[in-house]
Amino acid sequence: FPMFKRGRCLCIGPGVKAVKVADIEKASIMYPSNNCDKIEVIITLKENKGQRCLNPKSKQARLIIKKVERKNF
């Protein structure tokens, strides 16, 4: 990610409900911390189309979180 300022969440607004799987280059999960008190799921889009926040309550976000946690633990 580019440099982020401390003390604030990375996303603004509720986030997208879903992103086409074919458009996803990578997914990053930011867990609650001193900087932000909520979980954030950030999707990097293919073809240099930037980044989008996924609504952490969406079905797709829950699947991604589960997948990442399974991989890490």
Epitope: I12, G13, Q51, N55
Partner: nanobody
Framework: EVQLVESGGGLVQAGGSLRLSCAAS????????IGWFRQAPGKEREGVSI????????YYADSVKGRFTISTDNAKNTVYLQMNSLKPEDTAVYYC??????????????????????WGQGTQVTVSS
């Protein structure tokens, strides 16, 4: 049909003020962040100020902090940008946009995405010295 209609632009002298309005319709206000972006000739479109109507979170570009204030009237589905102490470098076309999933750190050189973003037609703001 989604519509974002901006008003309030114009010509103003340095040090003056303007208030931009953006009337939104055709979508659920709380599902989106609403913001003001600007594009000066030959420059990238940049996020100026954004507000999440669902929780009131705001973002301001460093260049406008302390001078610009964003607010919403949820009953009217309208977003306002109060611009004070205007400088010649604030001259640009100002666009109102509604979007989902905006990442704050990417706002300085924003890449619009038609699947997630709606845009107004823009309003010209010119600040003369």
């Amino acid at each position: 049909e989604v519509q974002l209609v901006e008003s309030g632009g114009g010509l103003v002298q340095a040090g003056g003020s303007l208030r931009l309005s953006c009337a939104a319709s055709g979508f659920t206000f709380d599902d989106y962040a609403i913001g003001w972006f600007r594009q000066a000739p030959g420059k990238e479109r940049e996020g100026v100020s954004i507000i999440s109507s669902s929780d009131g979170t705001t973002y301001y570009a460093d260049s406008v902090k302390g001078r610009f204030t964003i607010s919403t009237d949820n009953a009217k589905n309208t977003v306002y940008l109060q611009m004070n102490s205007l400088k010649p470098e604030d001259t640009a076309v100002y666009y109102c946009a509604a979007g989902q999933g905006w990442v704050i750190a990417t706002m300085t050189s924003f890449r619009a995405h038609r699947e997630y973003d709606y845009w107004g037609q823009g309003t010209q703001v010119t600040v003369s010295s």
